[in-house]
């Protein structure tokens, strides 16, 4: 069985303040079953950015329909970017369970925010 890969193709993304940022993430396999979550930062303090199954993420939307069968694209779009959104974002695969078990993280995408052009 091929090892699951979580692919974040861009090491960095630069966005002007006020614009939307797309953070790309795909997985190489549908197995094992379990959710993808997005975080900002690493370690115990990492911030939850997007979780499909629950939570309040008013500025974050999935690029593809994550409920669609055989979906392997878990990219997200963050709207109305501000300097406070800068940081490194990680796409993380979990195995379904009680609780879900973290399996693999993408390498991370660093989001930088440029001043809005005048």
């Amino acid at each position: 069985e091929e090892e699951l890969q979580v692919i974040q193709p861009e090491k960095s993304v630069s966005v002007a303040a006020g614009d939307s940022a797309t953070l790309n993430c795909t997985v190489s396999s549908l197995i094992p079953v379990g959710p993808i979550q997005w975080f900002r930062g690493a370690g115990p303090g990492r911030e939850l950015i997007y979780n499909l199954k629950e939570g309040h993420f008013p500025r974050v939307t999935a690029v593809s329909d994550p409920t669609k069968r055989n979906n392997m694209d878990f990219s997200i779009r963050i709207s109305n970017i501000t300097p406070a959104d800068a940081g490194t974002y990680y796409c993380v695969k979990f195995r379904k369970g009680s609780p879900d078990v973290e399996l693999k993280s993408g390498a991370g995408t660093e989001l930088s925010v440029r001043a809005k052009p005048s």
Partner: antibody, heavy 117, light 108 residues
Framework: DVQLVESGGGLVRPGESLRLSCAAS????????VTWVRQAPGEGLEWVSL???????YYADSVKGRFTISRDNSKSTLYLQMNGLRAEDTAVYYC???????????WGLGTLVTVSS | EIVLTQSPGTLSVSPGERATFSCRAS??????LAWYQQKPGQAPRLLIY???TRATGIPARFSGSRSGTEFTLTISSLQSEDFAVYYC??????????FGGGTKVEIK
């Protein structure tokens, strides 16, 4: 405005238990790790425990096996169950919100725990 | 475990003067060092993280710098509300999250 309000402190005897609560408001509680930090009278700050957004728990060696951190996301509340309390656990216990940088950006006012016979 | 040593333990400064104190890490923490201010009877307040980035709402008179494993917090012109205890904290190696022993800034 972000607010963290601790409760549950008090005077207990060595070996007894206490459960601290921290009610959070003004931010999306489920999206952030939260932590407990304590301060003995006249002393500095000592990190006690942290619970991540996914529920992973971390403890200082001094409390491992005696204290249990938990969170109830539906109530936006953080807890610290303290068993087998010792005199050296006497302190003001603060809860704090953790940023993705692993620093503590908002703190409660604290609740005093006194362990004495 | 990373040990943080703050010096001096107490600093006596007159209002309007510059205050500088340090925090030395027992091993490398990169730039992952934060500073907190605590006034008597109050909770700590985050001032600086990543060695030199001011937290939201912190006045520009507070600045941080790094030289290797030695970190410095400078208050350019002390105001009456700045007399407090200042703690450093490393945020690179966890757990545990470790704090320095504190520097008390008192009125001269």
């Amino acid at each position: 405005d972000v607010q963290l309000v601790e409760s549950g402190g008090g005077l207990v005897r060595p070996g007894e238990s206490l459960r601290l609560s921290c009610a959070a408001s003004g931010f999306t509680f489920t999206n952030y790790a939260v932590t407990w930090v304590r301060q003995a009278p006249g002393e500095g700050l000592e990190w006690v425990s942290l619970i991540s957004v996914t529920g992973t728990t971390y403890y200082a060696d001094s409390v491992k096996g005696r204290f249990t951190i938990s969170r109830d996301n539906s109530k936006s509340t953080l807890y610290l169950q303290m068993n087998g309390l010792r005199a050296e656990d006497t302190a003001v216990y603060y809860c704090a919100k953790v940023t993705w940088k692993n620093v503590f950006d908002y703190w409660g006012l604290g609740t005093l725990v006194t362990v004495s016979s | 475990e990373i040990v943080l040593t703050q010096s001096p333990g107490t600093l006596s400064v007159s209002p309007g003067e510059r205050a500088t104190f340090s925090c030395r890490a027992s091993q490398t923490v990169g730039s992952k060092l934060a500073w907190y201010q605590q006034k008597p009877g109050q909770a700590p307040r985050l001032l600086i993280y990543d060695a030199n980035t001011r937290a939201t709402g912190i006045p520009a008179r507070f600045s941080g710098s790094r030289s290797g494993t030695e970190f410095t917090l400078t208050i350019s012109s002390l105001q009456s509300e700045d007399f407090a205890v200042y703690y450093c904290q490393q945020h690179t190696d966890w757990p545990p999250y470790t704090f320095g022993g504190g520097t008390k800034v008192e009125i001269k």
